[in-house]
Structure formats: C-alpha cells, structure tokens
C-alpha cells in the first residue's frame, strides 16, 4: 500500500513570496497514483484545492483563484509538489496531500 510523507512540518513565508510544499510517495509508483491536495484554514472545514492524476491531468477546484496554486510531480524523487504563488493572508492554513491508488 502507498504511504505519504510531508517532510516540511511548517513553512513560513513573507507576504507575496512563493511557497513550495512537498509530498513524498512511497510503497507505490507515483506514476500509478493520483495525488490530491487539500487546505484547512484555521477554524474552517477542509477544502479540496488541486489534484494531479496518474496520467498527469491536473484538476482544480472551482472557485480557487487562477494562477494561485500549481501542482506537479517528480517521478525521480517520487514527490508531488504544491506551489503557492504570491503568499497572502488567505493562504495561511494546513495543507494535506492524499493518495488515490489506481
């Protein structure tokens, strides 16, 4: 079975900078899985943001600002990355990755 690890416990960024979060997949080939990213803002319910499927298709939640989030995967390191552009107050949250095994 697949296992996920988010090596960064926290990431502190200056306003307007870029944050890059990592999710390391083990126990399964990342190319055979879909990785989902979620956000949990303080005091709010968890929200789906973006996913990248086994075939590389990216799906974004409607209502998420265009250009704010970028998702990628690096098969060589078995890692999915979530890039948050122009970090601002609304981006303060806990970010989770999740796995869907095909």
């Amino acid at each position: 079975a697949g296992h996920l690890e988010q090596p960064q416990i926290s990431s502190t960024k200056t306003l307007s900078k870029t944050a890059r979060l990592e999710c390391v997949v083990s126990g399964i080939t990342i190319s055979a899985t879909s990785v989902y990213w979620y956000r949990e803002r303080p005091g709010e319910v968890i929200q789906f943001l973006v996913s990248i499927s086994y075939d590389g298709t990216v799906r974004k939640e409607s209502g998420i600002p265009s250009g704010k989030f970028e998702v990628d995967r690096i098969p060589e390191t078995s890692t999915s990355t979530l890039t948050i552009h122009n970090v601002e107050k609304q981006d303060i949250a806990t970010y989770y990755c999740a796995l869907w095994e095909v």
Partner: antibody, heavy 125, light 109 residues
Framework: EVQLVESGGGLVKPGGSLRLSCAAS????????INWVRQAPGKGLEWVSS????????YYADSVKGRFTISRDNAKNSLYLQMNSLRAEDTAVYYC??????????????????WGQGTMVTVSS | EIVMTQSPGTLSLSPGERATLSCRAS???????LAWYQQKPGQAPRLLIY???SRATGIPDRFSGSGSGTDFTLTISRLEPEDFAVYYC??????????FGQGTKVEIK
C-alpha cells in the same frame, strides 16, 4: 500617518455608473487586504467587497455581485470600486477599510483597523 | 449566510455604569474572526476588539470582549461620556458575506 482617503462619490441616476477610489498612505499597502463597507443613511454597516493583498481572492456581497468590481493597484497604493447598474438602494456612504493583517504564525485574526472618512454615493432620478 | 443579531437595540445607561452588549451568530463563528466596532455620528467606525477578546491599538482597558461559538459579548466596565455611541459586531466566516450585526445604541439615560 496611516491613512485611507476615499473619493469619487456623487449623484448618479439609476442604472448609471460610478468609480470610487481609495488612496492609502503611511503603511505598506501591498501587504494588506482591503474592504469596502457601506452605510445607508440612518442605517447600519454593510460589508460590500474585499480584495486580498495580491488580488487573488476577491469577494462580494450578494447585493452587489455582478454589478460592482473591486480592484487595486499596489504600485499606486490605490483601491477602486467600479459600480455599474446602480440602484436607489445603493445610496450610502462608502468606506474603504484595511484588514488587520497577519497576527500569528499559524492563524490570523480579522478586523478592520483603519477606515477612510467615507464618500457619499446618491442614486436618484 | 451567517446572521449576526445584536441585543439590546438600545441601552440607556448613565456615565460610570457597566454596559453589556450581546452579539449572537446564527451559526458557529471562529473566535479569531469576531470583531467589535464603535461608531459615533458623522464618523467612520473604529475597531475596538478583534479575535473576540483582543483590544485594538489605543483602545482603553475598560473595553473587553468575550465569548465563543455563537455567543459573544462586549463589556464596557465604566461608561465614560465619550463611550455613548453605536456598537457593531462583525464576523468573518469561511465564505462571504462578512456580516455586521444591526448595531446596539448606547445612550445616556
């Protein structure tokens, strides 16, 4: 001195348009979320719209959605509210107001800590 | 939409008395996202309390906020002449609108 100054109010006919401006000074404008709040004569406060520091997140009250557009120019330290298809019920004093900003490492607070003096918008035939 | 209901509508008190203003939300609001404002005639509102209980810069300690979930309170321990005004609560929820209460007027008895 930390300051917000609104301008652009006036008398307009129903169905008309108006563009409000809000000039900021005394603080790093590009680091703050900004809101528009209005107050009809003799009534309470009504939140209208907000825009985050980098303009990615924009929100509107249902009463103005599709008619009003909020924008900002961080290089000019300015906030704008384009108001189209104006109605009599849009008659109010319009305030721009600054959000508190980040107040913690893994959380944030909300509150409007700096307000302009307001600009009056009257919609009447 | 979260509806904020303030009570009472008007509070008639004398200087030196204690004022207790209530704000009730139609659904739970995070304490971090609850603010109180004071507004005097012809003036813009002034932030008093943010995060339900933190005083804004320059606000005297006779003003205090408390509460959580759906019930929040603004207390003025000893009313000064300059405290007679209209007070509003406002919530910032997980999605707009960021509604204000209808206001409580504190007037001189």
């Amino acid at each position: 001195e930390v300051q917000l100054v609104e301008s652009g109010g006036g008398l307009v006919k129903p169905g008309g348009s108006l563009r409000l401006s809000c000039a900021a000074s005394g603080f790093t404008f590009s680091s703050y979320d900004i809101n528009w709040v209005r107050q009809a004569p003799g009534k309470g406060l009504e939140w209208v719209s907000s825009i985050t520091s980098s303009s990615y997140y924009i929100y509107y009250a249902d009463s103005v959605k599709g008619r009003f557009t909020i924008s900002r120019d961080n290089a000019k330290n300015s906030l704008y509210l384009q108001m189209n298809s104006l109605r009599a019920e849009d008659t109010a004093v319009y305030y721009c107001a600054r959000d508190l900003g980040v107040r913690g490492v893994d959380y944030y607070y909300y509150g409007l800590d700096v307000w302009g003096q307001g600009t009056m918008v009257t919609v009447s035939s | 939409e979260i509806v904020m209901t303030q009570s009472p509508g008007t509070l008639s008190l004398s200087p030196g008395e204690r004022a207790t203003l209530s704000c009730r939300a139609s659904q739970s609001v995070s304490s971090s996202y609850l603010a109180w404002y004071q507004q005097k005639p012809g003036q813009a509102p002034r932030l008093l309390i943010y995060g339900a209980s933190s005083r804004a810069t320059g606000i005297p300690d006779r003003f205090s906020g408390s509460g959580s979930g759906t019930d929040f309170t603004l207390t003025i321990s000893r009313l000064e002449p300059e405290d007679f005004a209209v007070y509003y609560c406002q919530q910032y929820g997980s999605s707009p609108p960021y509604t204000f209460g209808q206001g409580t007027k504190v007037e001189i008895k």
